[in-house]
Interface confidence: medium
Amino acid sequence: KKVVLGKKGDTVELTCTASQKKSIQFHWKNSNQIKILGNQGSFLTKGPSKLNDRADSRRSLWDQGNFPLIIKNLKIEDSDTYICEVEDQKEEVQLLVFGLTANSDTHLLQGQSLTLTLESPPGSSPSVQCRSPRGKNIQGGKTLSVSQLELQDSGTWTCTVLQNQKKVEFKIDIVVLAFQKASSIVYKKEGEQVEFSFPLAFTVEKLTGSGELWWQAERASSSKSWITFDLKNKEVSVKRVTQDPKLQMGKKLPLHLTLPQALPQYAGSGNLTLALEAKTGKLHQEVNLVVMRATQLQKNLTCEVWGPTSPKLMLSLKLENKEAKVSKREKAVWVLNPEAGMWQCLLSDSGQVLLESNIKVLPTWSTPVQP
């Protein structure tokens, strides 16, 4: 008996071939001997089976002795043995219809779980193997689960169902809803305007939800909500913003925030959360702000940084075109009685300068100038 695997919702064509290459009488029946379809001369006739309007044949092939049974919009319950009767012969074809569906939704938040469920006909014992867009293989039976979805899991999942040495392939498009970056860091000199961007890693037709930026300033004992906003069909509208600092927010995606100026008291870490309509859970992106200030008070030239810096970052003070006078893995460096000239304060990581602030030290009878 020939075995054919079909996919729920798809169309399948079961073949039936006569030895004579001409149009002769045939009919297809199911295992209950109920007639599905057949012919009367050049006319297609249909029997009382539950397939009725979903069943068809190709009249153009009858003259060549081919009498296929086409079943459209396959259902799991269409799994059966189909019998083609032609020239006093019976050809049996076993059709097994499988379905593979994702739990609830194919748009999932980063960190959530994806469950794929296999629908199969009674008596079948299929095995399933799925390959994620990043090449990860998962095997299972009736259900397959992937916990802690990551951004790289977005894309087409290819799942192969194996039964009786035959296989059928399913493709499921999964969209992982996340920000492009889990975390970002902005380095600014004191007084500069700060731009924060929160690009999303997905595109959908309509995007609705609400969000908030909580900020933990390094100098503050507790975190504070800096801004709350709504998102309606990709349009951003601010609900509430603190008076200090007064953030500005772009009206279109990607989410974009402007801090009027970088100040030591604003340096710290923020967490932008976005709750999407009809989704449980929230998207998160961490943002960090490091602020540098170079000052000269009396005979002391000081350079300080505030905010989340890693222990391997180096802070240096140097006179332009000269060797560093002082370099430390600390948040403040200073030089006593600095000589006149343009001094540079540098924050660097493995030799790469992340932030630079210049301060002009004038001869001792003058006051310093900050360019």
Partner: antibody
Framework: QVQLVQSGAEVKKPGASVKVSCKAS????????IHWVRQATGQGLEWIGE????????YSNAKFKDRVTITADKSTNTAYMELRSLRSDDTAVYFC???????????WGQGTLVTVSS | DIVLTQSPASLAVSLGQRATITCKAG??????????MNWYQQKPGQPPKLLIY???NLESGIPARFSGSGSGTDFTLNIHPVEENDAATYYC?????????FGQGTKLEIK
């Protein structure tokens, strides 16, 4: 101690412009927002706008948006508020202010009387 | 804009008694457990003086005779016991949302 010292009284004709200054001392000028508030004679207080002196980012009340420009000069620790196309109902005392540790305006300039008269 | 309505427009209180001024906001000025309402005192020819911030916090240097209360849309400034020096105009101000707005003022007279 924190001090905000404003420029002297001005008399202007309708249609002219006025620029009021506010010199800050006793704190790091770029660390705090400077606000501008006005008060017509015998009337209440009205917020005009504000500036972040470090970056020069300014925000103003929509009522004044097309007529007001708020600026700051870091080198002199001075904030400015310029009001254009003056009308007689712009006659008022103009104050600059700075918040304290809370959300209220704890420090105020002495006020600048601007009289608009033909 | 958030409209702040003060009442009464003026009041006369005897020395040593309690003065109560109310301020009603056109919408809630609460957020995250705080009420963004401030109170000022202003005497003729002087700039306003901050008395209370965030509804109930006393500004440093202000005597404890002044107290603020309320949340949401309804706020109260109490002065008790009233002193001669308290004769002035009092303003409420919201710092919840731009544009920042003030009440129309309440003139306090001491009898």
């Amino acid at each position: 101690q924190v001090q905000l010292v404003q420029s002297g009284a001005e008399v202007k004709k309708p249609g002219a412009s006025v620029k009021v200054s506010c010199k800050a001392s006793g704190y790091t000028f770029t660390d705090y927002v400077i606000h501008w508030v006005r008060q017509a004679t015998g009337q209440g207080l009205e917020w005009i706008g504000e500036i972040y002196p470090g970056s020069g980012s300014a925000y103003s009340n929509a009522k004044f948006k097309d007529r007001v420009t708020i600026t700051a000069d870091k080198s002199t620790n001075t904030a400015y508020m310029e009001l254009r196309s003056l009308r007689s109902d712009d006659t008022a005392v103009y104050f600059c202010a700075r918040r304290g540790n809370g959300t209220g305006f704890a420090y105020w300039g002495q006020g600048t009387l601007v009289t608009v008269s033909s | 804009d958030i409209v702040l309505t003060q009442s009464p427009a003026s009041l006369a209180v005897s020395l040593g008694q309690r003065a109560t001024i109310t301020c009603k906001a056109g919408q809630s000025v609460d957020y995250d457990g705080d009420s963004y309402m401030n109170w000022y005192q202003q005497k003729p020819g002087q700039p306003p003086k901050l008395l209370i911030y965030v509804a109930s916090n006393l500004e440093s240097g202000i005597p404890a005779r002044f107290s603020g209360s309320g949340s949401g849309t309804d706020f109260t400034l109490n002065i008790h016991p009233v002193e001669e020096n308290d004769a002035a105009t009092y303003y409420c101000q919201q710092s919840y949302k731009d544009p920042l707005t003030f009440g129309q003022g309440t003139k306090l007279e001491i009898k």
